[in-house]
């Protein structure tokens, strides 16, 4: 059974994650970003179900393709890069899904924006967190 | 309006180590990054690392292995842990707010704080 403190950990990791899924969908959503036209002809894929942690493999496998969309955003300044972005998420996401099961992803039949993928990845989060708290 | 408050510059030799923090206040939104950027007398100003609030970081290649970013996202502070530190490390630090990964015009910027690497 979870003890208090690994439920603890497991939240503050969730809380991470979405604060760094809503800093992207933030960077995108920017009414000054030009390239958010193109940014949103890429299709990524989104999970037939994701409800469980053991769900965040979905996730982790769009992780690259969502690292080179971001990467079209070519500021001449980055506070932060795409990849330290994507690094961290990508560490936080091995946390959570753990690697004892290995768990084959199911994707839906219908691919998403940009928007569409972050936005259901940051309600996921939301959700495991509220039953945590 | 963000208020950026920065603390812990000042003078030490090469080798030794100094901890700068900086406090925002204002109007602070849960999602952002804070940072540290510094200025060298005579050169433009250049970053020296960057954190966000989920904990994602960036570090200028000439300070990686010596420098520590860390936050305290409920008091929204961020440290700058230097050691090792090196005379090419004296420059005037500053403290950035950003509400994105990328700089714009709403970034603030704090005073400044001295750092001076000297024997």
């Known amino acids: 059974a979870p003890t208090s403190s690994s439920t603890k950990k497991t939240q503050l990791q969730l809380e991470h994650l979405l604060l760094d899924l809503q800093m992207i969908l933030n960077g995108i959503n920017n009414y000054k970003n030009p390239k958010l036209t193109r940014m949103l002809t890429f299709k990524f894929y989104m999970p037939k179900k994701a409800t469980e942690l053991k769900h965040l493999q979905c996730l982790e496998e769009e992780l690259k393709p969502l690292e080179e969309v971001l990467n079209l955003a070519q500021s001449k300044n980055f506070h932060l890069r795409p990849r330290d972005l994507i690094s961290n998420i990508n560490v936080i996401v091995l946390e959570l899904k753990g690697s004892e099961t290995t768990f084959m992803c199911e994707y839906a039949d219908e691919t998403a924006t940009i928007v569409e993928f972050l936005n259901r990845w940051i309600t996921f989060c939301q959700s495991i967190i509220s039953t945590l708290t | 309006e963000v208020q950026l408050v920065e603390s812990g510059g000042g003078l030490v030799q090469p080798g030794g180590s100094l901890r700068l923090s900086c406090a925002a206040s204002?109007?602070?939104?849960?999602?952002?990054?804070m940072g540290w950027y510094r200025q060298a007398p005579g050169k433009g100003r250049e970053l020296v690392a960057a954190?966000?609030?989920?904990?994602?970081?960036n570090y200028a290649d000439s300070v990686k292995g010596r420098f520590t970013i860390s936050r305290d996202n409920a008091k929204n502070t961020v440290y700058l842990q230097m050691n090792s530190l090196k005379p090419e490390d004296t420059a005037v630090y500053y403290c950035?707010?950003?509400?994105?990964?990328?700089?714009?015009?709403?970034?603030?910027w704090g005073q400044g704080t001295q750092v001076t690497v000297s024997s």
């Open positions: 950035m707010y950003a509400s994105s990964w990328y700089e714009d015009e709403t970034d603030y």
């Open positions: 204002g109007s602070i939104f849960s999602i952002n990054v």
């Open positions: 954190i966000s609030s989920g904990g994602s970081t």
